[in-house]
């Protein structure tokens, strides 16, 4: 559930403290509610970033268990289409620490409306 | 050339247990994800588990979820699987197999062992 | 569960010819980031699987390329342009965009 996927970002931010990525990620700091899983996309593609540039199993491992996460507890809830949404790419750069608790704001938009 | 070795199949009775191993080599095993995937006889193919490459993560279906375990030694580049509280059902020839990841190009098991026959009678 | 139907399940073709298979899934296997983790295995006899395709269409190193891939959403389809006696085996889809993942019943392919 989306608890669980607030522990792996919990997790992921302090897997990175611990290293050095300086990289500047699209970020959705004013998620609209009828945008909210196109938003999650643009998080998600972001995060196998941080994924890559870190070369680190353990960031590897839990951005992977994350994606699994959310692909399930969305896909119970059958196919939402999404219009009028921003592209990942029109979205502001971030540096990471202020990516994630973006993600965490989300998140919990996700916990709030189940 | 990526080789696994999958063991430890045999006969065990209805309620009984079993561990099997695969033993992987010439390729960095701590690297990938790994699977089980078993084969009734004369049947298809289920998914059985998948375990992250780190062995924090693991996955598998309600066919076999709270009875079986999915785990590994990346020191000993080998996966296991301890099969508990064995049905009739279970009865199949397990393979483990490799299993690449997003960041190498996409989701698939590209590599698969020889499989071991587990056979669950009384 | 997505479940994954094949058709057909039993499939004879002369030597030469092409041949066809089609997976259907029970729901769409477009993952949230927009990929598709479809892939095709053979099962030749007596033998393990062995992977073909991935991702819907990519060939897997050292699969032939009269093999391919194509479909999208939930119809899938692996084509042979032309079936060498070495094709003769059991051909499986897989979906591992959703747990739990899911092998298709299986086509069984023979020399006619």
């Known amino acids: 559930n989306w608890v669980n996927v607030i522990s792996d970002l919990k997790k992921i931010e302090d897997l990175i403290q611990s290293m050095h990525i300086d990289a500047t990620l699209y970020t959705e700091s004013d998620v609209h509610p009828s945008c909210k899983v196109t938003a999650m996309k643009c998080f998600l593609l972001e995060l196998q970033v941080i994924s890559h540039e870190s070369g680190d199993t353990d960031i590897h491992d839990t951005v992977e268990n994350l994606i699994i996460l959310a692909n399930n507890i969305l896909s119970s809830n059958g196919n939402i289409t999404e219009s009028g949404c921003k592209e990942c790419e029109e979205l502001e750069e971030k540096n990471i620490k202020e990516f994630l608790q973006s993600f965490v704001h989300i998140v919990q938009m996700f916990i709030n409306t189940s | 050339e990526v080789r696994l070795m999958a063991s430890g199949g045999g006969l065990v009775q209805p309620g009984g247990s079993l561990r099997l191993s695969c033993a992987a080599s010439?390729?960095?095993?701590?690297?990938?994800?790994m699977s089980w995937v078993r084969q009734a006889p004369g049947k298809g193919l289920e998914w059985v588990a998948t375990?992250?490459?780190?062995?924090?993560?693991?996955y598998y279906p309600e066919s076999v979820k709270g009875r079986f375990t999915i785990s590994r030694d990346n020191s000993k580049n080998t996966l296991y699987l301890q099969m508990n509280s064995l049905r009739a059902e279970d009865t199949a020839v397990y393979y483990c197999a490799r299993r690449v990841s997003f960041i190498t190009g996409g989701w698939a098991m590209d590599y698969w062992g020889q499989g071991t026959l587990v056979t669950v009678s009384s | 569960d997505v479940v994954m139907t094949q058709s057909p399940l039993s499939l004879p073709v002369t030597l030469g010819q092409p041949a066809s298979i089609s997976c259907r899934s029970s729901q769409s296997i477009v993952d949230i980031t927009g990929n598709t983790y479809l892939e095709w295995y053979q099962q030749r006899p007596g033998q393990s699987p062995r992977l073909l395709i991935y991702?819907?269409?990519n060939r897997f190193s050292g699969v032939p390329d009269r093999f391919s891939g194509s479909g999208s959403g939930t119809d899938f389809t692996l084509k042979i342009s032309r079936v060498e006696a070495e094709d003769v085996g059991v051909y499986y889809c897989?979906?591992?965009?959703?747990?739990?993942?899911?092998f298709g019943q299986g086509t069984k392919l023979e020399i006619k």
């Open positions: 010439e390729f960095t095993f701590s690297n990938y994800a």
């Open positions: 897989f979906q591992d965009s959703f747990v739990p993942y899911t």
């Open positions: 375990i992250s490459r780190g062995g924090d993560y693991t």
């Open positions: 991702k819907v269409f």
